[in-house]
Interface confidence: medium
């Protein structure tokens, strides 16, 4: 899983002190905007829970792997969904934090619920401020279920979701009818794609048995470890106040991880840091409990003591999770929890063990995922340990998975599972891209999509003249920079190929497919001039031009006409592919538009000097705007529009077009036709209750006319959310918490 943590500071007495920090432990995280290291993104997600607009939140980057969001001015700013996105390419991951108002009517007993496919999920909303009205449950902002206030059990409203499937995942909320959505209890349901203990495409693979509350990822079988734990199976505790996949991060402030909520990639969700619990993560674990949210019990044996951050601390002579193993029993030492090798390499793997009696070479073995047992080729015996070295046969992809080092002596046995990732050296799927060319040089982008695994450590560009048998020239380049191939021959084709490498022995991939790049021909030098033009319709223009007379053949393949619409900031290009042409008809232009026009000669891909520009105004078309547009709310789902016909019409109106948009909404506007042009009013139905809308309209004769003024109006009351505006009544299924 991607090493990405979203931290929420829950000191809520003062919203201005609240902050969210997203920390990435990924190599090269957030380096910038290039394709090899996209930046960390941290934002409030307003798609489901919307809060009143306030001053914009402040985003501060601290180096390449940390970003912090501040500037919350009032408690309602905090309520809702926040997300952090990090990781590159296929590893791009979103971590989500859901914040509930501590003063809400309803509070979640538990915010994050991670369940397995097919399980029954039970969401429990605790009554904090009672109202004797129904409770509305929503799923991702859409109405889902109603509970009557009589249905509260022990001061809680329960929503049972049987046989859940991955699409059931999302944000659920429980709200008293007619209460502010900010007083809702918000939950996050994460449904793993497999049943308990399984992972993989067909859920055929067995999870490694994640310890200390780690959750098995349904796609890759890795354990997503709670904050404060590390290792393939989350078997190792970090030092107090540390988190991250390798315990490399430290909680800010003098009180360590107190008052912080940690959110990790799905399917983990969010929890307090190790050693803390409570809705604001400010309570230390009770005696005998430890770990994230204090969910784990120590049950130490043989005189072990319970540490709320790491679990059992064993006295001398004992080890194991519960101090249940005697030090006489052999023990695997310092085994890395994860190793990475490249495909078809033959790596050496070391496994060290200690114990009494002392382990010897033959007592340590290595077991591959397919059950094959490897015996060590040599052992280094030191006073405190024996290190066995294993020569691994040529690695294949099937060797990816959990390997096991096992030591057996008369004192007992120990084993340690570790993950081996067999990585495929990257092979370009596409040829490099030509950016620009001149007669003696080519500028090439080596960034191409590739099969296999990143990260890319080096990029080699190989090139030679086409059909040549001479050796390839090679240039090693930085993955993120464009390359200039210099000292080339003009008008010559070059075969160019990319080779990518990833870190580690055997990380060089095969060469990618070749592409032919041709150096340019001489550039055209003649400057045409515009002889004249005339308008042949509201959207058609006839243009003619000339070239100076020069001795010798014409260096050019054709002409490029350019029309620049300054008002809209749009350029239209028309290619005339004959160098003998001196006239062209331009069609499909925009009526009533002021264009700047020029023409230039081209040869191959090179453009000659442009003619002096001409300015052309096309005649307008389409009727004027309707007048005096007015909107009036009729109900919680209907708004009536009235208007007056445009003046000075050039012909009979065929229809009106109404544009509807939610005020402040990010979605596309909706256009509705009013097909009876004699009408001067219409009713827009199927709108959402208590929602502000913007309307404007225009008339159509042969073409669409100018837009009217924009009017704004809100629907009334509190009722069903509609499916969308229409001119006939229609009920709906979806809506947003406004």
């Amino acid at each position: 899983a991607v090493d990405l943590t979203l931290l929420a500071n829950l000191r809520l007495t003062d919203p201005q002190r609240f902050f969210l920090t997203c920390v990435s432990g990924e190599a090269g995280a957030g380096r910038g905007s290039d394709a090899w290291g996209p930046p960390l993104l941290l934002e409030k997600d307003d798609r489901i829970v919307r809060t009143p607009p306030g001053p914009p939140l402040r985003l501060a980057r601290n180096g390449s792997h940390q970003v912090t969001l501040r500037g919350f001015s009032k408690p309602s700013d905090l309520v809702g969904v926040f997300s952090c996105v990090g990781g590159a390419g296929a590893r791009r991951t979103r971590v989500i934090y859901v914040h509930n108002s501590p003063g809400a009517h309803l509070l979640p007993d538990k915010v994050t619920h991670t369940v397995n496919k097919g399980d029954t999920a039970v969401l429990s909303a605790r009554v904090h401020k009672e109202k004797q009205t129904d409770v509305i449950w929503k799923s991702n902002g859409s109405y889902f279920y109603t509970l009557d206030w009589h249905e509260a059990q022990d001061g809680r409203f329960l929503l049972q979701l049987p046989n859940v499937q991955p699409p059931s995942s999302g944000i659920y909320s429980a709200t008293y009818l007619e209460a502010s959505p900010l007083g809702s209890a918000f939950f996050r349901l994460i449904v793993r794609g497999c049943g308990a203990g399984r992972w993989g495409p067909g859920c055929t693979k067995e999870c490694p048995g994640c310890l200390h509350g780690g959750v098995c990822h349904d796609h890759d079988g890795e354990c997503v470890c709670p904050p404060g734990f590390t290792g393939t199976r989350c078997e190792q505790a970090c030092r107090e106040g540390r988190f991250g996949q390798s315990c490399q991060e430290q909680c800010p402030g003098i009180s360590g991880c107190r008052g912080l909520t940690f959110c990790l990639p799905d399917p983990y969700g969010c929890s307090c840091g190790s050693g803390w619990r409570g809705s604001q993560c400010q309570e230390a674990c009770a005696p005998g409990h430890f770990g994230a949210d204090c969910r784990l019990q120590c049950q130490c044996q043989n005189g072990g003591t319970c540490d709320r951050f790491s679990g059992c601390v064993c006295p001398s002579g004992w080890h194991g999770v519960h101090c249940e193993k005697s030090d006489r029993i052999p023990q695997i030492l310092n085994m890395a929890s994860e190793l990475e090798f490249n495909l078809e390499t033959m790596p050496r793997i070391n496994c060290a063990a200690a114990g009494n009696p002392f382990p010897v070479r033959g007592s340590i073995e290595l077991r591959k995922p397919d059950g094959t047992v490897l015996l060590s080729t040599k052992a280094i015996v030191e006073p405190e340990k024996t290190t066995a070295e294993f020569e691994v046969p040529r690695l294949v992809l099937a060797d990816s998975g959990f390997w096991e080092c096992r030591v057996s002596t008369s004192g007992g046995q120990d084993s340690r599972r570790f993950k081996v990732n067999v990585k495929v050296p990257p092979v370009p799927l596409a040829a490099p891209r030509l950016l620009t060319k001149q007669s003696r040089q080519l500028v090439v982008s080596p960034l191409v999509s590739f099969s296999g695994d990143g990260p890319i450590s080096t990029v080699r560009l190989h090139y030679r003249p086409q059909d040549s048998t001479m050796d390839w020239s090679t240039i090693v380049v930085d993955p993120s920079e464009n390359v200039t191939l210099m000292n080339l021959r003009p008008k010559t084709g070059y075969s160019v190929r990319v080779q990518l490498s990833r870190p580690g022995e055997g990380g060089e991939g095969a060469w990618g497919p070749p592409t032919l790049m041709t150096t340019d021909c001489p550039e055209p030098l003649l400057q045409p001039w515009l002889e004249g033009w005339h308008v042949e319709g509201t959207d058609r223009l006839r243009v003619s031009w000339s070239l100076p007379l020069v001795p010798g053949p014409l260096v050019g393949d054709g002409f490029l006409l350019r029309l620049w619409d300054g008002t809209r900031g749009q350029e239209r290009r028309e290619n005339v592919s004959s160098p003998q042409a001196r006239t062209a008809l331009l069609t499909g232009l925009t009526p009533g538009t002021h264009y700047q026009l020029d023409v230039q000669l081209y040869h191959c891909t090179l453009l000659g000097p442009a003619s002096p520009p001409a300015h052309v105004l096309l005649p307008p078309s389409g009727p004027p705007a309707p007048r005096h547009l007015h909107a009036q709310a009729l109900s919680d789902s209907e708004i009536q529009l009235t208007w007056k016909h445009p003046e000075a019409l050039p012909g009979p109106i065929s229809k009106y077009v109404v544009e509807v948009q939610v005020a402040g909404g990010a979605g596309d506007p909706l256009w509705i036709d009013v097909d009876r042009p004699e009408e001067t009013s219409t009713i827009i139905r199927g709108l959402n209750a208590s929602t502000r809308y913007l309307f404007r309209m225009r008339a159509s004769i042969q073409g669409l006319g100018d837009w009217s003024n924009t009017v704004e109006e809100s629907t009334l009351g509190n009722g069903l959310q509609a499916e969308g505006p229409v001119q006939e009544s229609r009920a709906a299924e979806e809506g947003l918490d406004q």
């Epitope: 009557d148 249905e151 009818l177």
Partner: antibody, heavy 113, light 115 residues
């Protein structure tokens, strides 16, 4: 295993009364909404009534409103339907069913009235 | 008279696919994603086979699938088998608003004959 067993059906004259019972087992009865659905001979299903877990909130089809009363005893895991002023058109097999969210997920075998 | 309209009967040969439609209004089928389907064999209680338009409860064959468009819901049974013979009822949760005035409406039922 969820089980629902109806009883109390029988022959009754128009204008008479009858009380149906439904004994529930295999699940936490007090946590679920429950309902009655009937089926006239050779005809389709018709929802009759439903009741919330606490018993404090009930709903009825228009055809039985004012004549039928649904109730429950959570301590006995039992659902009841008291039917008064019975009419010939109330003749049907009456099914007791557990309500989960927006549907009936388990049904009893029914009792004929 | 049932509130939701279903065809009285459909038939198909083993291995074929059939579809049963269920038409309501915007106050029931069209207004909610809460259509369920029940199978009933003669003399037996109804059995839930589809909930919430297209969700199959655990233990129900994946040959049964549901869908909805506008005011019409549909049940499709693929790879017909002799044991599919029986009556099929659609049902929709119906409510006038967000309040608890909850009702359920049923279709008149469709008799499926496997030839």
């Amino acid at each position: 295993e969820v089980q629902l067993l109806e009883s109390g059906g029988g022959l009754v004259q128009p204008g008479g009364s009858l009380r149906l019972s439904c004994a529930a087992s295999g699940f936490t009865f007090s946590s679920y909404k429950m309902g009655w659905v009937r089926q006239a001979p050779g005809k389709g299903l018709e929802w009759v009534s439903s009741i919330y877990p606490s018993g404090g909130w009930t709903h009825y089809a228009d055809s039985v409103k004012g004549r039928f009363t649904i109730s429950r005893d959570n301590s006995k895991n039992t659902l009841y339907l008291q039917m008064n002023s019975l009419r010939a058109e109330d003749t049907a097999v009456y099914y007791c069913a557990r309500v989960l969210l927006h549907y009936f997920d388990y049904w009893g075998q029914g009792t004929l009235v | 008279q049932s509130v939701l309209t279903q065809p009285a009967s459909v038939s198909g040969s083993p291995g074929q696919s059939i579809t049963i439609s269920c038409t309501g209004t915007s106050s029931d089928v069209g207004g909610y994603k809460y259509v369920s389907w029940y199978q009933q064999h003669p003399g037996k209680a109804p059995k839930l086979i589809i909930s919430d338009v297209n969700n199959r409860p655990s233990g129900v064959s994946d040959r049964f699938s549901g869908s909805k468009s506008g005011n019409t819901a549909s049940l499709t049974i693929s790879g017909l088998q002799a044991e599919d013979d029986g009556d099929y009822y659609c049902s929709s949760y119906a409510s006038s608003s967000y309040t608890s005035s909850t009702t359920w409406v049923f279709g008149g039922g469709t008799k499926l004959t496997v030839l």
